[in-house]
Interface confidence: medium
C-alpha cells in the first residue's frame, strides 16, 4: 500500500512539476525591468526566452519576438535547449509512469517489468528537473552578471553611452517558476526511484533444512532453491528460475550517468 | 543620448532610384545595421542588414535591387534602392543593435523616412 502511495505522489508531484517547466518555459517575464530610481516609469519591459514585451501605463502589452540580425546568443540558445530537453524527457516519463503504476493493470504485465518502468520514469524526472534547474539557473546568473555590470556603469560614469542607454534587468517571475517546478519535477522523480524498489518481485532465498526419511540417513537440501510455493509476491511462479531474474537490490545497482554540457 | 538619425526619403516614381543614409550619432559602435520598413496597416519588415563582420541579409523582396552598405568610420549604413515599385512604399526605419552583456541586443531605432512610390 505504501508503495502504491509513493509512486502515486510521485507521479503527481512530477505531473505538476513538468506542467511547471512547461509554463516556465512559455511565459514572457524570465527577465524584467529594474524599476530602481526610476519607479514611475511609464513604460515597462520584460523579456522571455522566445519574446520581449512592452507594457505601457495605459496597461496597453505589446510582445514581438527577437529582431536580430546576429542570431541569438549561444547562451540563449543553451537555455531554451535544457528547457525543451527538460520538457521532452519529462514528458516522455510521464508517458512511461503512466503504465507502470501499480493501480493500473495493463495485460499480464509484471511487477518486475512495473518496477524497471517505475525506475525508467524516475530517472528521466530527475534529469528532467535538473535541466529546468540548470536552464533557469544559467539564466539567473547571466542576469546577475549584467545587473551588477550595468550598475557598476550607472554610478562610475564608464562606459560611455552604455550609461544612458542601458536597462537593468532582475529576475522575472518565470524563474521562480522554473526553479519550483524543476524541483519538484526532481522530488517526484526521487519517489518513483524509491517506489521501484517496494515493486522489485520479493524473491525470498529459504535456508537449508535437513529432512530425515524414516528408516534412511538421506539429507535433502534444497538450499538457494527460490520460494515457489505461493508464498510472497511471486504467486504466478513465472520466470523465478530465469537467470534474468534479479533480487530488489540488483534493480538499484543499475549505473546511471548523466552528462550535462 | 544614442540617436539614429535618417535622411533621403521621398517621393520617387516607379523604376527610379533613391538612397536613404543613416547616421548614428554619440560613441555608438553597433554590431549590426539595417533598414526596416513599415507599410501602413503592415507589421514593421527587414529590408537590409549588415552586421560587424560584414554578412549581409537582404528580403527576398528586394534582392538583386538594393544594396546595404556600412562606413565604420563614419558610423552610418546606406540603402542603395533601385528599380523602385509602388509596393516599395512605406516609412522606413533605421535600426542598430548592440550586445551588452545580457542575452538580448540592445535595439535602437530611428524616427522613420517616408518612401513613396508614385507617378
Known amino acids: 500500500m505504501a508503495v502504491t502511495a509513493c509512486q502515486g505522489l510521485g507521479f503527481v508531484v512530477s505531473l505538476i512539476g513538468i506542467a511547471g517547466i512547461i509554463a516556465a518555459t512559455c511565459m514572457d517575464q524570465w527577465s524584467t525591468q529594474d524599476l530602481y530610481n526610476n519607479p514611475v516609469t511609464a513604460v515597462f519591459n520584460y523579456q522571455g526566452l522566445w519574446r520581449s514585451c512592452v507594457r505601457e501605463s495605459s496597461g496597453f502589452t505589446e510582445c514581438r519576438g527577437y529582431f536580430t540580425l546576429l542570431g541569438l546568443p549561444a547562451m540563449l540558445q543553451a537555455v531554451r535547449a535544457l528547457m525543451i530537453v527538460g520538457i521532452v524527457l519529462g514528458a516522455i516519463g510521464l508517458l512511461v509512469s503512466i503504465f507502470a503504476l501499480k493501480c493500473i493493470r495493463i495485460g499480464s504485465m509484471e511487477d518486475s517489468a512495473k518496477a524497471n518502468m517505475t525506475l525508467t520514469s524516475g530517472i528521466m524526472f530527475i534529469v528532467s528537473g535538473l535541466c529546468a534547474i540548470a536552464g533557469v539557473s544559467v539564466f539567473a546568473n547571466m542576469l546577475v552578471t549584467n545587473f551588477w555590470m550595468s550598475t557598476a556603469n550607472m554610478y562610475t560614469g564608464m562606459g560611455g553611452m552604455v550609461q544612458t542607454v542601458q536597462t537593468r534587468y532582475t529576475f522575472g517571475a518565470a524563474l521562480f517558476v522554473g526553479w519550483v517546478a524543476g524541483g519538484l519535477t526532481l522530488i517526484g522523480g526521487v519517489m518513483m526511484c524509491i517506489a521501484c524498489r517496494g515493486l522489485a518481485p520479493e524473491e525470498t532465498n529459504y535456508k537449508a533444512v535437513s529432512y530425515h526419511a524414516s528408516g534412511h540417513s538421506v539429507a535433502y537440501k534444497p538450499g538457494g532453491f527460490k520460494a515457489s510455493t505461493g508464498f510472497g509476491s511471486n504467486t504466478k511462479n513465472k520466470k523465478i528460475y530465469d537467470g534474468g531474474a534479479r533480487t530488489e537490490d540488483e534493480v538499484q545497482s543499475y549505473p546511471s550517468k548523466h552528462d550535462y554540457v | 543620448q544614442v540617436q539614429l538619425v535618417e535622411s533621403g526619403g521621398g517621393l520617387v516614381q516607379p523604376g527610379g532610384s533613391l538612397r536613404l543614409s543613416c547616421a548614428a550619432s554619440?560613441?555608438?559602435?553597433?554590431?549590426?545595421m539595417a533598414w526596416y520598413r513599415q507599410a501602413p496597416g503592415k507589421q514593421r519588415e527587414l529590408v537590409a542588414g549588415?552586421?560587424?563582420?560584414?554578412?549581409?541579409n537582404y528580403a527576398d523582396s528586394v534582392k538583386g535591387r538594393f544594396t546595404i552598405s556600412r562606413d565604420f568610420a563614419k558610423n552610418t549604413v546606406d540603402l542603395q534602392m533601385n528599380s523602385l515599385k509602388p509596393e516599395d512604399t512605406a516609412v522606413y526605419y533605421c535600426?542598430?543593435?548592440?550586445?551588452?552583456?545580457?542575452?538580448?541586443?540592445?535595439?535602437?531605432w530611428g524616427q522613420g523616412t517616408l518612401v513613396t512610390v508614385s507617378s
Open positions: 535600426n542598430a543593435e548592440i550586445y551588452t552583456g545580457t542575452f538580448y541586443p540592445r535595439s535602437y
Open positions: 554619440g560613441e555608438i559602435s553597433s554590431d549590426a
Open positions: 549588415m552586421t560587424r563582420g560584414g554578412s549581409t
